[in-house]
């Protein structure tokens, strides 16, 4: 038993890192493999994550961390049985994927404007929630060519856009995922979509 | 929100022992360590040790060892720190701290006097 | 005696910018990571700055901390009254048992 492609690691930078990797041939990864890991810190203890399949020879591991910050450093050994299959560090802030926003909503009362709101997926004392920046992607249901991506920039999480922006009487969804430039973090999975029907008034020809 | 609440002040005789506490809320107790330091009238801060309240394991400054022993009990979310053999160079506020790399919060402390 | 060294007192008037050095060695700030802690009369530190540079959420951007080699500097802008008390580096000693180190501790009085 081999690995054909050696562990690679994101973390959440708040309590999880997923690791994946391949082995060199079909394997039951719950049965077979274990994954410790263990923070470079005095008194640290090593943790045992048990990794799941992710395809035929594809193996994914969760591993729980707590109060995760950009000093921290973890020891990595795969084990099959009593053999050692590889041994690696990882550090988690330099490899961040952050948690996607959730509760995204469009606010369709405002007059001709739509509000789209969202959540920050970070609590106010972890590093991130004050230094996310977010995509909002925007697309039409009957027309795949109107499809459109906007950067907020700032860190309030909301968008607003003018209806008129969008075409009335049909149907849009949107989604939101967020990345953090201080770390360097990759973009976020997207928030799960939400629909709605674009109506405003057309201004009156004069 | 976080808060570290410590015992109060205490008079010791030189030789016998004191035993200050730090009990933590507003956040998991066994997720963060728990640091011991100290500070003598008008001097600077002395590091004395860490607790991981997870599994109760210790690590003390070389200048404590002997003399120190930090324990937890997860059921009240209360960390202790326990300084026996007192001498009056022991008189000092006596810090818990939360943190790992570095301290995010501090109790109030607590002023041990020894004095004969 | 600590092996973080810092200037025992700076002055400054208000209004004006402060910069507290902590100089250490190549065990310490030169292999680790920094953060400042603010003392204010009869209170417990508070941490100011951490990993090097960066602030708790509710930590004013008047104050800033930079670290270069073995040596680290916590500036303050804008300097004002309330911010007159006692500060104190901190770092990790690498060279036998990791262990927390803290600076000497600096008095700045605002004039």
């Known amino acids: 038993m081999k690995v054909l492609q050696e562990p690679t690691c994101v973390s959440d930078y708040m309590s999880i890192s997923t690791c994946e990797w391949k082995m060199n041939g079909p394997t039951n990864c719950s049965t077979e493999l274990r994954l410790l890991y263990q923070l470079v810190f005095l008194l640290s203890e090593a943790h045992t994550c048990i990794p799941e399949n992710n395809g035929g020879a594809g193996c994914v591991c969760h591993l729980l961390m707590d109060d995760v910050v950009s000093a921290d450093n973890y020891t990595l050994d795969l084990w099959a049985g009593q053999q050692l299959l590889w041994k690696g560090s990882f550090k988690p802030s330099e490899h961040v994927k952050p948690r996607a926003p959730g509760n995204l909503t469009v606010h369709t009362n405002v007059s001709d404007t739509l509000l789209l709101t969202w959540s920050n997926p970070y609590p106010p004392d972890n590093y991130l929630y004050n230094h996310l920046t977010y995509a909002v992607n925007i697309w039409s249901e009957n027309d795949p060519a109107d499809f459109r991506i906007y950067n907020v920039t700032y860190l309030e999480p909301s968008l607003r856009i003018a209806a008129s922006t969008l075409k009335s009487g049909i149907s849009y969804r949107a989604r939101v995922r967020a990345w953090a430039q201080c770390y360097n973090t990759t973009w976020s999975e997207w928030s799960p979509s939400t629909k709605w029907h674009n109506s405003y008034r057309e201004p009156f020809e004069q | 929100q976080v808060q570290l609440v410590q015992s109060g002040a205490e008079v010791k005789k030189p030789g016998a022992s004191v035993k200050v506490s730090c009990k933590a809320s507003?956040?998991?107790?066994?997720?963060?360590?728990m640091h011991w330091a100290r500070q003598a009238p008008g001097q600077g801060l002395e590091w004395m040790g860490i607790?991981?309240?997870?599994?109760?394991?210790?690590s003390y400054a070389q200048k404590f060892q002997g003399r120190v022993t930090m324990t937890r009990d997860t059921s009240t979310s209360t960390v202790y720190m326990e300084l026996s053999s007192l001498r009056s160079e022991d008189t000092a506020v006596y810090y818990c701290?939360?943190?790992?790399?570095?301290?995010?919060?501090w109790g109030k402390g607590t002023l041990v006097t020894v004095s004969s | 005696q600590s092996v973080l060294t810092q200037p025992p007192s700076v002055s400054a008037a208000p209004g004006q910018k402060v910069t507290i050095s902590c100089s250490g060695g190549?065990?310490?700030?030169?292999?680790?990571?920094v953060s400042w802690y603010q003392q204010l009369p009869g209170t417990a530190p508070k941490l100011l700055i951490y990993?090097?540079?960066k602030r708790p959420s509710g930590i004013p951007d008047r104050f800033s901390g930079s670290k270069s080699g073995t040596s680290a500097t916590l500036a303050i802008t804008g300097l004002q009254t309330g911010d007159e008390a006692d500060y104190y580096c901190?770092?990790?000693?690498?060279?036998?048992?990791?262990?927390?180190?803290f600076g000497t501790g600096t008095k700045l009085t605002v004039l």
């Open positions: 701290a939360r943190g790992k790399w570095w301290l995010y919060d």
């Open positions: 507003g956040y998991a107790f066994t997720s963060y360590y």
């Open positions: 607790i991981n309240p997870s599994g109760g394991s210790t």
């Open positions: 190549s065990s310490n700030i030169g292999n680790s990571y």
């Open positions: 990993d090097n540079n």
């Open positions: 901190g770092t990790w000693d690498t060279s036998t048992t990791l262990q927390p180190l």
